[in-house]
């Protein structure tokens, strides 16, 4: 079944290569287990950046080695991507799946364009 997911159109990464945004999905109702996947679209290719499953009983938990962190509250997930560089500029799509109990719902946002500007190296001082 289809479900709406919303995310901001544009986000500018910090000078440290960190970008955060909220992914909000149509009310989870009685969803007990939710999977959030961050996808990066480059041209026609879509690659998975990170993913996490959380339950209404627990916090959002990405793998320790993940480039993402996040927190969940109701039907909103605050996602943070770290280690971004200029070549990481692109469209980042939030995908939300209501996994359990049935029925299964899936929703995808329209994507957030993340702009990453590598910091200029400090000029040598005389």
């Amino acid at each position: 079944k289809g479900m709406h997911a919303a995310q901001p159109a544009v986000v500018l990464a910090s000078s440290r290569g960190v970008a955060s945004f909220v992914c909000e999905y149509g009310s989870s109702g009685n969803a007990a287990e939710v999977r959030v996947t961050m996808l990066r679209q480059a041209g026609s290719q879509m690659t998975e950046v990170c993913a996490a499953t959380y339950t209404v009983e627990d916090e959002l938990a990405f793998l320790d080695d993940s480039t993402c962190t996040g927190t969940s509250s109701g039907n909103k997930v605050n996602l943070t991507i770290q280690g971004l560089r200029a070549m990481g500029t692109g469209l980042y799509i939030c995908k939300v799946e209501l996994m359990y109990p049935p029925p299964y719902y899936v929703g995808m946002g329209n994507g957030t364009q993340i702009y990453v500007i590598d910091p200029e190296p400090c000029p040598d001082s005389d």
Partner: antibody, heavy 116, light 112 residues
């Protein structure tokens, strides 16, 4: 404190109807599905079905399709189990239970006796 | 429907001794997301059931580590490493993977 308080159990004649209540407190009622479980005297637990407290959509186990109806009053944080055309075999303790990925919270159970 | 078969129907154990209860499902209870929603509950006379184990092997908060769950696919086991007087009651397995969700028939544990 999260609580499920049940009421409505009674001695009812065969052919009659009954409505059992399950009042929830201590959490957001519409965030969790409410399930109903039957336990006949001296018998095990039998899953009757559940109702999505957000959408109001019920799901019934095959043995409980027809005479059994799950309903809600979200303003009162209460789930109901209505049983029509009562039979002797409906005599049981009925439990409501809140489910997420498990049942951590149960009502105390309410006893329904169907007898003439 | 998924039939959950528990064995034994009853067992009598001395305090301090281990106990083991088996639960077998008539088909795999792995849900479409890869999880197995297999739980264990203990019901004492005149009381509501209490959750012990969820998702096969996860102990619910406050449950003593004497209780452990294991298994996969269709075969599951609840183990009590050292039985105590408070453990007496009827144990039920439950599958929440395939609707209609179903309970096992129960296993009565009594102390010698």
């Amino acid at each position: 404190e999260i609580q499920l308080v049940q009421s409505g159990g009674d001695l009812v004649k065969p052919g009659g109807s009954v409505r059992l209540s399950c009042k929830a407190s201590g959490y957001t009622f519409t965030n969790y599905g409410m399930n109903w479980v039957k336990q006949a005297p001296g018998k095990g637990l039998q899953w009757m079905g559940w109702i999505n407290t957000y959408t109001g959509e019920p799901t019934y186990a095959d043995d409980f399709k027809g005479r059994f109806t799950f309903s809600l009053d979200n303003a009162k944080n209460t789930a109901y189990l209505q049983i029509n055309s009562l039979r002797a075999e409906d005599t049981a303790v009925y439990f409501c239970a809140r489910r997420s990925i498990y049942y951590p919270y149960w009502g105390q159970g309410t006893t329904l006796t169907v007898s003439s | 429907d998924v039939l959950m078969t528990q064995t034994p129907l009853s067992l009598s154990v001395s305090p301090g001794e281990p106990a083991s209860i088996s639960c077998r499902s008539s088909q795999s209870i792995v849900y479409s997301n890869g999880n197995t929603y297999l739980e264990w509950y203990l019901q004492k006379p005149g009381q509501s059931p209490k959750l012990l184990i969820y998702k096969v092997s996860n102990r619910f908060s406050g449950v003593p580590d004497r209780f452990s769950g294991s298994g996969s696919g269709t075969d599951f086991t609840l183990r009590i490493s050292r039985v105590e007087a408070d453990d007496a009651g009827v144990y039920y397995c439950f599958q929440g993977s395939h609707v209609p969700w179903t309970f096992g028939g129960g296993t009565k544990l009594e102390l010698k």
